[in-house]
Amino acid sequence: MAVTACQGLGFVVSLIGIAGIIAATCMDQWSTQDLYNNPVTAVFNYQGLWRSCVRESSGFTECRGYFTLLGLPAMLQAVRALMIVGIVLGAIGLLVSIFALKCIRIGSMEDSAKANMTLTSGIMFIVSGLCAIAGVSVFANMLVTNFWMSTANMYTGMGGMVQTVQTRYTFGAALFVGWVAGGLTLIGGVMMCIACRGLAPEETNYKAVSYHASGHSVAYKPGGFKASTGFGSNTKNKKIYDGGARTEDEVQSYPSKHDYV
C-alpha cells in the first residue's frame, strides 16, 4: 500500500511540476522592468522566452515575438532548449508512469516490468526537473549580470544636459514558477525511484527445492533466501506461486517518508 501511495503521489507531484514547467516556459514574465529606485514610468516592460511585452498605464498591452532565431543571444537559446528538453522528458515520463502505476492493470504486466517503468519515469522526471531548474537559473544569472551592468551606467548623459534612462530588468514571476515546478518534478521523480524499489522483487524467485539432511528437515532456498526451518520461525501466512514464495503484505513492507510540498 505504501509503495502504491508513494508511486501515486510521485506521479501527481511530477504532473503538477511538469504543468508548471510548461506554464513557466509559455509565460511572458521571465524578466520584468525594475521599478525600485527608478523614475516612475507610465510604461512597464516585461520579457519572456518567446516575446517581449509593453504594458502602458492606459491599460494597452503590446507584445512582439522574437521573429529571429539567429539574432537571439546564445544564452536565451540555451534556456529555451533546456526548458523544451525538460518538457519533452517530463511528458514522456508521464506517459511511461501512467502504465507503470500499480493501481492500473494492463494485461498481465509483471511487477518487475512496472518497477522498471517506474524507475525509467522517475529518472526522466529527475532529469526534467534538473533541466527546468538549470534553464531558469541560467536566465536568472543572465539577468543579474545585465542588472549590475546597467546599474553601472544607469544614466548615460549627453554633455551633462540630456539623460537617457536605461531600463533595468529583474526577476519575473516565471522564474519562481520555473524553480518551484522544477523542484516538484525533481521530488516527484525521486518518489518514483523510491517506489520502484518497493515494486521490484528483492530476490530472484525460484521454485523452492528441498534437500533432506539426516536428522533435520531444513528447506534450502537458493538465491539469497535465508534458510528457514519448517518449525515456527516464520509465522507469516504464505501463498505459494509458481515463481516462488512471497508474503501477502510484502508490498507494504517498505516504510516511506513523504515530503508534502
Epitope: T41, V43, S52, V54, E56, S58, G59, F60, V162, T164
Partner: antibody, heavy 118, light 113 residues
Framework: QVQLQESGPGLVRPSQTLSLTCTAS????????MNWVRQPPGRGLEWVAF????????EYNPSVKGRFTILRDNSKNQLSLRLSSVTAADTAVYYC???????????WGQGSLVTVSS | DIQMTQSPSSLSASVGDRVTITCKSS????????????LTWYQQKPGKAPKLLIY???NLQTGVPSRFSGSGSGTDFTFTISSLQPEDIATYYC?????????FGQGTKVEIK
C-alpha cells in the same frame, strides 16, 4: 459617441474642500484609465492626476499630492477629483480626459472652471 | 520632473505655409521595450478642450487630417503642419507620456498673417 461631462461648484473659498465629478458615456468606462488635467486662466496645461481602469493604481502631480484625491465609480461611470485645502493657485479649468493607446489623452471633457477666492 | 521645452512660443504664418514646431525633453522618451517614443501632440482652440493629434511621436490619431505629422526620437521632436489652413489657428502642446508626472510643453500659439 464618447462624451465626458465635468461638473463642480465653481466658486470656493481658500482652504475649503470641493469635489469635481466627470460623467462618462459612449464607451465602456471600466476599460479605460482616466486623468484630470487643469489649465489656469491664460496659461498652459498641467496634468493633475491619473487613475487606472480598476481604480487600484493612482498617480499625482507633486504639486497636488496629499491635497487632491482621484476616485472612480465604475458602476456609475463616474470619475471624481476631491480637492482639499485649496488656494488661489488651484484656480483653473479642470478637464477630465480618457487615457488611451500610447498613454495619450484621446477624449476630453469641456472643462469645469474652479475659482478659489475669498 | 521631465522638462518639456517647446519652440517657438508663438508664430505667424500664411495660409498654405509649412509650419514646424519643435519640442525638447530633458530625458529620453524612447522606451527600449517597444522602440516607441512616448510623446504626444495636442491642439487647443480658444475656449475649447485640447484635441489629440499625434501619439507615439509620429502616429496620427484617427480622424486627424494628414497635413499634421510628427517625427523625432529620444529627446528631440518635431511637429509639422504641411499646409497651414485657417482652421489650424490654435495653441499646440507636446506632452511627455513616459514619466510621471506627465508634463506638457508651454505651448506654441499659431496665428495667421
Amino acid at each position: 459617441q464618447v462624451q465626458l461631462q465635468e461638473s463642480g461648484p465653481g466658486l470656493v473659498r481658500p482652504s475649503q474642500t470641493l469635489s469635481l465629478t466627470c460623467t462618462a458615456s459612449g464607451f465602456t468606462f471600466s476599460k479605460y484609465a482616466m486623468n484630470w488635467v487643469r489649465q489656469p486662466p491664460g496659461r498652459g496645461l498641467e496634468w493633475v492626476a491619473f487613475i487606472s481602469n480598476g481604480g487600484s493604481y493612482t498617480e499625482y502631480n507633486p504639486s497636488v499630492k496629499g491635497r487632491f484625491t482621484i476616485l472612480r465609480d465604475n458602476s456609475k461611470n463616474q470619475l471624481s477629483l476631491r480637492l482639499s485645502s485649496v488656494t488661489a493657485a488651484d484656480t483653473a479649468v479642470y478637464y477630465c480626459a480618457r487615457h488611451d493607446k500610447g498613454n495619450a489623452l484621446d477624449y476630453w471633457g469641456q472643462g469645469s472652471l474652479v475659482t478659489v477666492s475669498s | 520632473d521631465i522638462q518639456m521645452t517647446q519652440s517657438p512660443s508663438s508664430l505667424s504664418a500664411s495660409v498654405g505655409d509649412r509650419v514646424t514646431i519643435t519640442c525638447k525633453s530633458s530625458q529620453s522618451l524612447l522606451n527600449s521595450g517597444n522602440q516607441k517614443n512616448y510623446l504626444t501632440w495636442y491642439q487647443q482652440k480658444p475656449g475649447k478642450a485640447p484635441k489629440l493629434l499625434i501619439y507615439w511621436a509620429s502616429n496620427l490619431q484617427t480622424g486627424v487630417p494628414s497635413r499634421f505629422s510628427g517625427s523625432g526620437s529620444g529627446t528631440d521632436f518635431t511637429f509639422t503642419i504641411s499646409s497651414l489652413q485657417p482652421e489650424d489657428i490654435a495653441t499646440y502642446y507636446c506632452q511627455n507620456d513616459y514619466f510621471y508626472p506627465l508634463t506638457f510643453g508651454q505651448g506654441t500659439k499659431v496665428e495667421i498673417k
